[in-house]
């Protein structure tokens, strides 16, 4: 930002009103008036070029320093060419000297040269030659000097003429300030420029109304240079939640809009399924029946729990059930749907029911399922089972109601035994089987049925309480169809699948395990 100049003295704007002192009195410097552009132009002039040694002083009024540390002195003046005077005026000069003196009080008309310190010799860039002067084309020079640091209450400037033909048209004394500034939503106060050229005054900014320094961010700071310019901005402020940046200010979000954190982003429109927000909202409340999960961003629409799984089937396969379902028709507006399966078993005789999680086995953990099917095994025969599939999403925990569907299935048979061939010979087959331990207590005996492959007219049956049997008196090199079925008090359980086992040919010797 451009530096601000604070004027302490302006001769052109006040003329004789300032009451400058000339020394010696009545000689040397003289106050005159010209008219230029419809305005009286005042000047102090001196032109004693023919009179030998000159020492003419012009002292300003006492100038109150105020808060200035370094002052700038701008001079506008004309100097006539010494050659434009007869004989080149041997004592003629084309420069004058600029002095200053600091003091804590106004000495009035008491002028003492010894108190003054020389700032510089002022020389013109252009001198006014005779032809220009006669044509009233004077060459105006502008020179600027600076002095600092100043420490006393006020100061004088003085101009020493040593024999030049000079007209002083403007003397402007000012100091520089870095102007009041709004940047990065921070306000920086008007600040006096320092007095030392290399130094930069660090100035802390304050966030404008409804703006804050972001967490972990730097406090706003700027540097005020000697020339009154702001440099090197550091840090910034951001509009707080509920407010957005409009030009250099933070404005409350309009009704129906919100902003949930301090950021550079504008206010956002309230998402779906929210109530219209008031002015300056940091979030938008959910409509009745809609919710926001703790981890949901405020910009996300409000959602609700899903409806129940749409369609649930329970297909029994012996002591196993495959549960299948389709996703809820209404997802509640969310994609994070998971399913939970629970199981209840009832004894038909007593009608007594209880949870069966401990006695059954699921093909995958029954809670937090993302797939839409699961297989439940190790079910007990002659038992009624009710399976509940509940659909849940990220906001289900915010309501007490549940969305579920149930399916019941009666297990009338044991699970088919798993059969394997333990050994064989030319005339025998050794067979073993297993069923899930929970079902074993209900089995009275096992029935092994076998016959030659291709002979549908006759079959043999063997019963045993154990889990294996050796079938003897078989024909060599012959394939037999073998099935094992559990017998319970209530009747037959599910039969195993029919296995094909072959006896050894006579060339093969011994009892070989397969």
């Amino acid at each position: 930002a451009q530096g601000k100049e604070v004027v302490l003295l302006d001769f052109a704007a006040a003329g004789g009103e300032l009451g400058w002192l000339t020394h010696p009195y009545g000689k040397g410097w003289d106050l005159m008036q010209n008219i230029m552009n419809d305005m009286p132009i005042y000047m102090y002039s001196v032109c004693n070029v023919m009179s030998g040694d000159q020492d003419n002083w012009l002292r300003t009024n006492w100038v109150y320093r105020g808060e200035a540390e370094r002052i700038f002195i701008e001079l506008k003046f004309t100097v006539r060419d010494c050659n434009s005077f007869p004989g080149g005026a041997s004592s003629c000069k084309e420069t004058f000297n600029l002095y200053y003196a600091e003091s804590d009080l106004d000495y009035g008309t008491n002028f003492q040269k010894r108190l003054f310190t020389k700032i510089d010799t002022i020389a013109p860039d252009e001198i006014t030659v005779s032809s220009d002067f006669e044509a009233r084309h004077v060459k105006l020079n502008v020179e600027e000097r600076s002095v600092g640091p100043l420490t006393r209450k006020g100061f004088y400037l003085a101009f020493q003429d040593i024999g030049a033909c000079v007209a002083l048209l403007s003397v402007r004394v000012y100091y520089k300030k870095c102007p009041e500034l709004l940047q990065g939503l921070a306000h920086f106060p008007e600040t006096i420029a320092g007095s030392d050229a290399p130094s930069l005054a660090t100035v802390a900014g304050t966030c404008v109304d409804h703006a804050v320094v972001p967490p972990g961010g730097e406090e706003p700071r700027m540097h005020c240079a000697v020339d009154g310019e702001w440099l090197v901005p550091i840090g910034q402020c951001l509009c707080q939640a509920g407010y957005e940046k409009v030009e250099d200010a933070c404005q409350a979000c309009s009704p129906g809009f919100f902003k949930f954190e301090a950021s550079e982003s504008p206010c956002l429109e309230c998402p779906e399924h929210t109530l219209p927000s008031p002015e300056g909202a940091t979030s938008c409340e959910c409509e009745e029946g809609f919710f926001r999960a703790p981890q949901d961003p405020a910009s996300m629409p409000c959602t609700r729990p899903p409806s129940a799984p749409h369609y649930l089937t329970a297909v029994g396969m012996g002591a196993k059930v495959e549960l299948r379902w389709t996703p809820p028709q209404d997802s509640g507006g969310r994609e994070d749907i998971v399913y939970s399966v629970t199981c209840e078993q009832c004894w038909p005789e007593s009608g007594e029911c209880g949870p069966c999680e401990a006695s059954v086995r699921y093909s995958e953990p029954p809670h937090g399922l993302t797939r839409t099917s699961v297989t439940v095994s190790d079910l007990e025969p002659h038992m009624n089972y009710t399976f509940t599939v509940e659909a849940r999403n990220g906001v289900s925990g915010l309501v007490t109601s549940r969305s579920f569907r149930t399916a019941s299935v009666s297990i009338n048979q044991t699970e088919p035994p798993k059969v394997r061939l333990e050994g064989r010979s030319t005339t025998s087959l050794s067979v073993s089987w297993s069923i899930p331990p929970p079902q074993q207590s209900r089995v009275w005996k096992y029935e092994v049925t076998y016959r030659k492959k291709g002979d549908s007219n006759s079959y043999n049956v063997r019963r045993t309480e154990g889990f294996s049997v050796t079938l003897d008196d078989l024909a060599p090199d012959t394939t037999y169809l073998v099935q094992v079925q559990a017998l319970t008090q209530e009747g037959q359980g599910a039969g195993s699948k029919v296995h094909e086992f072959q006896t050894l040919s006579p060339e093969g010797s011994g009892n070989l395990a397969v």
Partner: antibody, heavy 119, light 106 residues
Framework: EVQLQQSGPELVKPGASVKISCKAS????????MHWVKQSHGKSLEWIGF????????GYNQRFKNKATLTVDTSSSTAYMEVRSLTSEDSAVYFC????????????WGQGTTLTVSS | QIVLTQSPALMSASPGEKVTMTCSAS?????MYWYQQKPRSSPKPWIY???NLASGVPARFSGSGSGTSYSLTISSMEAEDAATYYC?????????FGGGTKLEIK
């Protein structure tokens, strides 16, 4: 004692001209600028221009450049302002005012001349 | 041209009360001048070079300001101070006056 004595009130017809006078006394007439200021009824002040009696140099507010002409008679220490092509807009009190010695304000004022333009 | 805006346009004060009126310039000016005008009288110089009191002006008056903002203050209002006060600048041509602040006694 510095005094500026202005001529009396004027009632003139639209389109005509009028010349108002301001006689100075109590100081060296040629050393000070003489300014003219307009004050419309119940309104603020408007600077018309000035004349430097020493050499007759003048300066005008651009708004009045074609409306007013400033002159002086140094022998009688009198300043004049002629206002031409009068309209009702020119109806006002006109003041002459001495410029502070080589300064930017007006330290002595005449009593004012009321100009009324009416048909 | 520089426009000077005075505020308030009209104000009233009780005897002994402190009074402040302001003059705001459309561009920065180096100095401000103030005049007092009473009904059916010509203006009188009151304050020159921003803060200097003209001859005969009571010490209860003061002027201050810089840049675009200037003010005239009466430390303790008296009946004779009731008048219209005009600010004036001549830092740039043409010289201009403010619209005036009319000060009345309560």
């Amino acid at each position: 004692e510095v005094q500026l004595q202005q001529s009396g009130p004027e009632l003139v017809k639209p389109g005509a001209s009028v010349k108002i006078s301001c006689k100075a006394s109590g100081y060296t007439f040629t050393d000070y600028n003489m300014h003219w200021v307009k004050q419309s009824h119940g309104k603020s002040l408007e600077w018309i221009g000035f004349i430097y009696p020493y050499n007759g140099g003048t300066g005008y507010n651009q708004r009045f450049k074609n409306k007013a002409t400033l002159t002086v008679d140094t022998s009688s220490s009198t300043a004049y302002m002629e206002v031409r092509s009068l309209t009702s807009e020119d109806s006002a009190v006109y003041f002459c005012a001495r410029g502070y010695y080589y300064g930017r304000h007006f330290d002595y004022w005449g009593q004012g001349t009321t100009l009324t333009v009416s048909s | 041209q520089i426009v000077l805006t005075q505020s308030p346009a009209l104000m009233s004060a009780s005897p002994g009360e402190k009074v402040t009126m302001t003059c705001s310039a459309s561009s920065s000016v180096s100095y401000m001048y103030w005049y007092q005008q009473k009904p059916r009288s010509s203006p009188k110089p009151w304050i020159y070079i921003t803060s200097n009191l003209a001859s005969g002006v009571p010490a209860r008056f003061s002027g201050s300001g810089s840049g675009t903002s200037y003010s005239l203050t009466i430390s303790s209002m008296e009946a004779e101070d009731a008048a219209t006060y005009y600010c004036q600048q001549w830092s740039s041509n043409p010289p201009t006056f403010g619209g005036g602040t009319k000060l009345e006694i309560k």
